[in-house]
Interface confidence: medium
């Protein structure tokens, strides 16, 4: 196998087509991104097309909490999702092709840890197998990045500014601009996972408004300009 010592191969039973599971030792990804947790297996039940269940759990094998589960009916390629923790887990592989690879969306630092894949044949060939070593998911922190900055019409012919940034840990946002004191307090908006939004509710003067996002890994800045057309004197 070309993936060398990154791979854990677990097997038991007789030679020929035995139960075995292949998972990489470690997968690295950045917070906010998606990660693929690969898992493939072989089994002794030739051409099995009965009902099956694919399971992923976290923490420890056999007993850790399930984060994903799907079931496929006899003769069906469709593995219907029965559990996807926070809706962020989905099967990337095809269990009928001995592939249980899982995709994890919108990673957070708290997702770091070990994950274990398991397959259960629940038909005549009643059998199951689970990865003992699992795959270690390492989620690394992400420096701030401003994903959107804009000026929008506000109440009473005024304007307001919005700044959305992402990072892990979630960055703190601050606005600065041409108002007296050259700085304005931002109303911290709703944070969605690793994204945060701050609003500057009233832009009182023309000029440059700068949004700064900062966390323990760094800072990012973006600016927007407001120029209103004033009628001739």
């Amino acid at each position: 196998d070309a993936s060398g010592d990154l791979l854990n191969t677990e097997a038991h039973s007789a030679p020929a087509q035995r139960w075995s599971m292949q998972v990489p030792a470690e997968v690295n990804a950045e917070a906010g991104d998606a990660a693929v947790l690969p898992c493939t297996f072989t089994h002794p039940h030739r051409h099995y097309d009965g009902p099956l269940t694919a399971i992923w759990r976290s923490g420890e094998p056999y007993a850790g909490p399930q984060v994903f589960r799907c079931t496929a009916a006899p003769g069906s390629e469709l593995c219907q999702t029965a559990l996807s923790l926070h809706g962020r887990f989905r099967l990337l592989g095809n269990p009928r092709r001995n592939d249980l690879s899982l995709r994890v969306e919108r990673l957070a630092l708290a997702d770091s840890g070990r994950y274990f894949c398991r397959v259960e044949f629940t038909g005549d060939a009643h059998d199951r197998y689970e990865s003992r070593h699992g795959v270690r998911l390492r989620v690394t922190a992400a420096a701030p990045r401003i994903v959107n900055i804009s000026v929008l019409p506000g109440p009473a012919h005024a304007f307001r500014a919005l700044c959305t940034a992402e990072g892990e840990p979630p960055p703190a946002l601050a606005w600065s601009g041409p108002a007296p004191g050259n700085s304005s307090a931002a109303l911290q908006g709703q944070g969605h996972g690793y994204q945060v939004t701050a609003e500057l509710p009233a832009l009182t003067r023309d000029g440059r408004y700068t949004c700064t996002a900062a966390n323990s890994l760094g800072r990012a800045e973006a600016s927007v300009y407001l120029f209103r057309f004033h009628g001739a004197p």
Epitope: D1, V27, P38, T40, D49, E77, G93, R97, D99, R103
Partner: antibody, heavy 117, light 108 residues
């Protein structure tokens, strides 16, 4: 950016051999199953072969079984297709494609294989 | 082995809805994928898992599956949608299967 680049195509006589390569970049190659798909001139797509991320599972279309061998070198981020006992009907553009259960989401630009005497 | 059957060609006026069918035994119990291929280019995945759209694919592309027939629907068809479209699924024998392809012509 995510990219697949095939190479190794060319003109070969019936009964001859050829090895195609597919260099992957811009993504973690070791995490993904890979496939070869071919398209004869003016015809539709035909799946040729599949290999799991760890090389533990390989599958072939009936039309190439016993003649073609799929493999991968994860240390080189490269997918291969060894084609032996080539026939005129193997003439096609050969694409490598990333993917398994969510479809083939990344394709190479293809390499032309012509089998003719 | 499963066989997927598509109409060889479908024509549609700009702005109208195009529907491309793909039929096969027991297709309702399988995931279906759709690919768009323009002349001289590699195919592009436009629908996966029967009705999901990859990022970057316009919302006018959608998929459905009823009985033994899967359908790719393009609403508000544009000239740039003119291409060949292929459906694909997996077979129990671990074979991947493509339909024969449908040439979509946008009139005008």
């Amino acid at each position: 950016q995510v990219q697949l680049v095939e190479s190794g195509g060319g003109l070969v006589q019936p009964g001859g051999s050829l090895r195609l390569s597919c260099a992957a970049s811009g993504f973690t190659f070791t995490n993904y199953a890979m496939n070869w798909v071919r398209q004869a001139p003016g015809k539709g797509l035909e799946w040729v072969s599949y290999i799991s991320y760890s090389s533990s599972n390989t599958y072939y279309a009936d039309s190439v079984k016993g003649r073609f061998t799929i493999s991968r070198d994860n240390s080189k981020n490269t997918l291969y297709l060894q084609m032996n006992s080539l026939r005129a009907e193997d003439t096609a553009v050969y694409y490598c494609a990333r993917g398994a259960g969510l479809g083939y989401d990344v394709w190479g630009q293809g390499t032309l294989v012509t089998v003719s005497s | 082995d499963i066989e997927l059957t598509q109409p060889p060609s479908v024509s549609v006026a700009p702005g109208q809805t195009a529907r491309i069918s793909c039929s096969g035994d027991n297709l309702r119990s399988k995931y279906v994928y759709w690919y768009q291929q323009k002349p001289g280019q590699a195919p592009v995945l436009v629908i996966y898992d029967t009705n999901d759209r990859p990022s970057g694919i316009p919302e006018r592309f959608s998929g459905s599956n009823s009985g033994n027939t899967a359908t790719l629907t393009i609403s508000g068809t544009q000239a740039e949608d003119e291409a060949d479209y292929y459906c694909q699924t997996y077979d129990m024998t671990s074979q991947d299967v493509f339909g024969g392809g449908t040439k979509l012509t946008v009139l005008g």
